[in-house]
Amino acid sequence: AGVFELQIHSFGPGPGPGAPRSPCSARLPCRLFFRVCLKPGLSEEAAESPCALGAALSARGPVYTEQPGAPAPDLPLPDGLLQVPFRDAWPGTFSFIIETWREELGDQIGGPAWSLLARVAGRRRLAAGGPWARDIQRAGAWELRFSYRARCEPPAVGTACTRLCRPRSAPSRCGPGLRPCAPLEDECEAPLVCRAGCSPEHGFCEQPGECRCLEGWTGPLCTVPVSTSSCLSPRGPSSATTGCLVPGPGPCDGNPCANGGSCSETPRSFECTCPRGFYGLRCEVSGVTCADGPCFNGGLCVGGADPDSAYICHCPPGFQGSNCEKRVDRCSLQPCRNGGLCLDLGHALRCRCRAGFAGPRCEHDLDDCAGRACANGGTCVEGGGAHRCSCALGFGGRDCRERADPCAARPCAHGGRCYAHFSGLVCACAPGYMGARCEFPVHPDGASALPAAPPGLRPGDPQRYL
């Protein structure tokens, strides 16, 4: 166990051209605060992934008002360290994210507004118990100077805070097998580190690396409850048996406790023992309150002011997560209808609609025929966001303005010849065929294949069908 400590030295414009504008103004005074997020290992994880080693918020800095005409100076900082307690071993390699937040103190409806000014990230190697490490990181035109260290909490010592120490029993030397506990030379190392993952509730050790179980528990990490309900009666060759161990799946399998919490099984379910700074059924809630301003991106904090009461962040549109820290890809919900193109502008969502559609979400189907005339007696037909003209005989084109050649499509079957006519077209049929398009054969006996002759006509009469 131990504490990671972060000291912010300065936050202000970086060197070089393009100095940033001051984040505060006479009309909108503001103050800064910082958030640090730690993850074990040299991970390349996204900013939204959990801060598995822990996270902390600083206090608010002094209120700052820009002096008109003056360049942006280093901004006034909060007092004190940011401290992230860690329960287990210090991993030695870690990733960090440090965010600089601005709290605007103008006449905001519903309280102050928060916005992210800068975010820096890095991956470092660090031994616990070492000196302060200094660092400079740049984010755009801003520069952040800070120091950090990891220190162990007694009785833990060592570069990973896994060694325990005890006072020397004799002034000159440690007991058998025990080394001096550098740098505490007056103490001796206590080699009582159990097997990794050994259940704190059901296991213990007297030798390094062992895990001995509470009676009623079994398994290499003492996480499996012993059941004797399915035991066979001790008969025959196994008469020396007094019972059997039937490991059943436990509610702690897979460790449901987050943030380094340890799981213990209860008669009905499980209970998480949470590290300092976390609480909740699964240690999913950090011990911050609304007074700490844990809701980012303008989220509204609701909850008690005492450490035992949780808070809930009500996020503004476009953000989600327990602290409103995640930007929602609002276009992934496909809010634009009728094939509209979605644009997430951050402060708002826009839909670029296809022709024939309108509205914030392209939900309105425009009257495609409104104000559109089809020439030469054509009629307008709506559909698919575009208008179409159904043209009168003899005309074609989008607006029926083109005179159509009715014979272009060769409409007369069986070698009939096509003639353009004011009312459309006329087919002169080849011998043996009849009909408007010469589609019906004439039988040799003079009977046609027509199912019935039109009224007033006898089958076999020479005719034209128009």
Epitope: A156, L164, L192, C194, C198, E201, G203, E271, T273
Partner: nanobody, 117 residues
């Protein structure tokens, strides 16, 4: 430095009761799992009962229903109330805890509990 001091042991007849106390100094243990252990000469030490920071308890099968573990985080103290004591409960009782994968402290002197008629 971390120190755990057990007290409250003594001699008692079968069926009697004792209350053991363990006071911790040099550490704030309110988030640590604390436990009572016992050892009979010539046998390995065994875990008797544990209590989490939130007050959830676990007991060895042999003491369930007879022993009760509790803690007072404000006083940095953990207790073991032992009722209906049996001769097989005779042992040296120790207090210790767990923090992460480590034991919280070195084993202290312990307190002797003797149950005999």
């Amino acid at each position: 430095q971390v120190q755990l001091v057990e007290s409250g042991g003594g001699s008692v007849q079968p069926g009697g009761s004792l209350r053991l106390s363990c006071a911790a100094s040099g550490i704030v243990f309110n988030s640590d799992v604390m436990g009572w252990y016992r050892q009979v000469p010539g046998k390995p030490r065994e875990l008797v009962a544990t209590i989490t920071g939130g007050g959830s308890t676990n007991y060895a099968t042999s003491v369930k229903g007879r022993f009760t573990i509790s803690r007072d985080n404000a006083k940095n103290t953990v207790y073991l109330q032992m009722n209906s004591l049996r001769p097989e409960d005779t042992a040296v009782y120790y207090c210790n805890g767990r923090r992460g994968d480590s034991m919280l402290a070195f084993w202290a002197q312990g307190t002797q509990v003797t149950v005999s008629s």
